[in-house]
């Protein structure tokens, strides 16, 4: 006899990286007929929702109107059908960004390189942080973590046209509190036409959409919550 229900999916909209003082919604998707959802924060009960009518709703949304460092951390959710509770969802790491300072991102040998060249990004921040994160815009979650007193190196190795795109970096004050994003650096990788056609670029977005777009599009996020849980969030573990 089944003792628990399948775990729900948890995700954040528009994104798990939330600029301070901005709003975020934590979504929990369980099953139709669930009479209660519970959101837990760092192991403690944070919020409760009872959808009405439960038989027509399989997802609830928990609103955080004003993101700050005290709200950043690990969230999970569970739901109940009758007296039977679900397994807990995967952990959602909610990150507050735009804290304190802005790092500087540079690339060596430069932003325009030939396929096969070795490329290294450098992220520098002169305040008290030793962890840095390099992110490539696009639906895929290209995230690298680096360490250094005031600067981290991110060697990409010999690049291909798949490395083309717009990069930004963050300084991380702890796992859930990140700096402002750096100014974007667009990496252009030239190769022969045949190779280029075989390595399409990730869908990228204009720089001014960064604030709402960040690592992934909302639609991409909604299409596969499980995949999202296991990719972009893994850097925080």
């Amino acid at each position: 006899q089944q003792q628990t229900l399948p775990k729900p999916f948890i995700w954040a909209e528009p994104h798990f990286m939330v600029p301070k003082e901005k709003q975020v919604t934590i979504c929990c998707q369980g099953n139709y007929g669930a009479v209660e959802y519970q959101l837990h924060f760092e192991g403690s009960l944070f919020a409760v929702d009872r959808p009405k009518p439960p038989e027509r709703i399989n997802k609830v949304q928990f609103y955080i109107p004003d993101m700050n460092s005290r709200m950043a951390g690990q969230y999970s959710c569970i739901y109940r059908v009758g007296e039977l509770w679900s397994e807990p969802s995967n952990l959602l790491d909610l990150v507050v960004t735009e804290m304190y300072d802005t790092p500087t991102l540079s690339v060596h040998p430069g932003p325009e390189v030939i396929s096969g060249e070795k490329v290294t990004f450098y992220c520098r921040l002169d305040t008290a942080t030793s962890m840095f994160l390099l992110l490539k815009e696009g639906r895929s979650s290209h995230v690298q973590r680096g360490y250094g007193k005031v600067q981290a190196e991110f060697p990409l190795g010999p690049v291909t046209t798949a490395h083309r795109g717009t990069y930004r970096c963050f300084g991380s004050y702890n796992n859930h509190a990140w700096s402002f994003p750096s100014e974007p650096v667009k990496l252009l990788v030239t190769g022969d036409i045949e190779n280029t056609s075989l390595a399409p670029e990730d869908p990228t977005f204009p720089a001014d959409t960064w604030g709402t777009y960040l690592l992934t599009t909302e639609t991409g996020l909604q299409k596969d919550h499980a995949l999202w849980d296991h990719t972009a969030q893994n850097l925080l573990r």
Partner: nanobody, 127 residues
């Protein structure tokens, strides 16, 4: 922000009842999910009861379930906590709190979810 003022506390014998009120000034309470917390000397602040914006949904922990009832009158901008069968363990300062939310059904149980707090009202239950 919303200003919150609690009242209704006092000294009561074990087994008695009290009704706490929390009046909001300036802004409409309909914008907020509301909650009651309490803090006894030397202990952490503890969630006691929460209610959704519309008042349709409430939640209380097992420690007070069946004894404490939270309700709200959005027309009057008032939040209530009806406390029955009081015990000496219920002695504490009781605080009401408000959390701005778009959701009609969210109830917040964690103090970090609440942005606005009252000054508190003392409830003392004697044996």
């Amino acid at each position: 922000q919303v200003q919150l003022v609690e009242s209704g506390g006092g000294l009561i014998q074990a087994g008695g009842s009290l009704r706490l009120s929390c009046v909001a000034s300036e802004r409409s309470l309909t914008l907020y999910a509301m909650g009651w917390f309490r803090q006894a000397p030397g202990l952490e602040r503890e969630f006691v009861a929460g209610i959704s914006r519309t008042g349709d949904t409430t939640y209380s922990p097992d420690s007070v379930k069946g004894r404490f009832t939270i309700s709200r009158d959005n027309a009057k901008n008032v939040l209530y906590l009806q406390m029955n069968s009081l015990k000496p363990d219920d002695t504490a300062v009781y605080y009401c709190a408000a959390s701005a939310t778009y959701s009609a059904t969210n109830i917040y149980t964690h103090q970090r979810a609440y942005g606005d707090w009252g000054q508190g009202t003392q409830v003392t239950v004697s044996s």
